[in-house]
């Protein structure tokens, strides 16, 4: 039975040209995290495997930095980066847990963080 929950940074906004940290946290389970995949709607951004290290997709290599931790830092933001991002936690023995973050990249200098929320 999957008892864990993913806590994410929720709905966030950032300025064009700036950077943002995409972060998820798995709690309420003793399952071992073996890998975390970071995805956009239809493409992979990165994979962090506990043993094999990081994979950064070539289309993001110039502006994605691994970490902090299992998170991902997205740099040189453009308006096209606006959208949904998913953290997929591969765990043993539970299976996969998915968290969702919505990022809005703003033209203006007013960019505030949204509230944190949980996805069961």
């Amino acid at each position: 039975m999957m008892t864990g929950t993913i806590e994410t940074t929720g709905n966030i906004s950032a300025e064009k040209g700036g950077s943002i940290i995409l972060q998820c946290h798995l709690s309420s389970t003793t399952a071992q995290v073996t890998q975390v995949n970071w995805e956009q709607q239809d493409q992979l951004l990165a994979i962090c495997n506990a043993d094999l290290g990081w994979h950064i997709s070539p289309s993001f290599k110039d502006r994605v930095a691994p970490g902090p931790g299992l998170g991902l830092t997205l740099q040189s933001l453009t308006v096209n980066d606006t959208g949904e991002y998913f953290c997929i936690y591969h765990t043993y023995p539970d299976g996969t847990y998915t968290g969702r973050i919505f990022l809005e990249v703003l033209e203006s200098s007013v960019a505030e963080h949204g509230a944190r929320f949980q996805i069961p």
């Epitope: 073996t34 890998q35 995949n37 995805e39 239809d42 493409q43 992979l44 994979i47 495997n49 506990a50 043993d51 094999l52 290290g53 990081w54 994979h55 950064i56 997709s57 070539p58 289309s59 290599k61 691994p66 591969h90």
Partner: antibody
Framework: QVQLVQSGAEVVKPGASVKVSCKTS????????MHWVKQAPGQRLEWIGG????????RNNQKFKGRVTITVDTSASTAYMELSSLRSEDSAVYYC????????????WGQGTLVTVSS | DIQMTQSPSSLSTSVGDRVTITCKAS??????VVWYQQKPGKAPKLLIY???YRYTGVPSRFSGSGSGTDFTFTISSVQPEDFATYYC?????????FGQGTKVEIK
């Protein structure tokens, strides 16, 4: 230039073990993950597992049920794959392969080592 | 484990023809797919990764596309040196898995 040179062919008896080596050169050994891939005659390629020489962490295919041990000697820039309790279906060509820096695609491969399990 | 199924398993073609190979994953693998070429008695060679980027030195006649579960590998105009077996592989989750291969033969 990057090179991966594997040890020579082996003929081993059922129940025994075999240890295949993969000597690398032309790049910084600790920066790239090393993998082992099996190819039995007429079969698809099969990922055995990989190891991150920098931290020593390794991930193995559970199909091999603990019979495989992947290690590295960073001072010799060499990776090893040991397979125990050998049976006839382990007869295959075994390849070492390196994946790129922060990239899982296996970009350089060894020449392969033929292991024949026969009594 | 994620199963990768290629089609066709083999095909006969002539120099100059266009060849398309498909690879279907048993579950979502996003864009974590790679294509290799293997000739008899030789190690595989990386051609395409992620899944539309040509590896260094790979001719432009080779291309790849796809996302999710469906992927395509194309040789726009087959050359004599292209007769070989081609494999897709996913690295979305471990264990990494390969397709069964597609043998491209001379007609």
């Amino acid at each position: 230039q990057v090179q991966l040179v594997q040890s020579g062919a082996e003929v081993v008896k059922p129940g025994a073990s075999v240890k295949v080596s993969c000597k690398t050169s032309g790049y910084t050994f600790t920066e790239n993950t090393m993998h082992w891939v099996k190819q039995a005659p007429g079969q698809r390629l099969e990922w055995i597992g990989g190891i991150n020489p920098n931290q020593g962490g390794n991930r193995n295919n559970q199909k091999f049920k603990g019979r495989v041990t992947i290690t590295v000697d960073t001072s010799a820039s060499t990776a090893y794959m040991e397979l125990s309790s050998l049976r006839s279906e382990d007869s295959a060509v075994y390849y070492c392969a390196r994946s790129g820096l922060r990239d899982y695609a296996m970009d350089y491969w060894g020449q392969g080592t033929l292991v024949t399990v026969s009594s | 484990d994620i199963q990768m199924t290629q089609s066709p398993s083999s095909l006969s073609t002539s120099v100059g023809d266009r060849v398309t190979i498909t690879c279907k994953a048993s579950q979502h693998v996003s864009t974590a797919v790679v294509w290799y070429q293997q000739k008899p008695g030789k190690a595989p060679k990386l051609l395409i990764y992620s899944p539309s980027y040509r590896y260094t030195g790979v001719p432009s006649r080779f291309s790849g596309s796809g996302s999710g579960t469906d992927f395509t590998f194309t040789i726009s105009s087959v050359q004599p040196e292209d007769f070989a077996t081609y494999y897709c592989q996913q690295h979305y989750s471990t264990p990494w898995t390969f397709g069964q291969g597609t043998k491209v033969e001379i007609k």
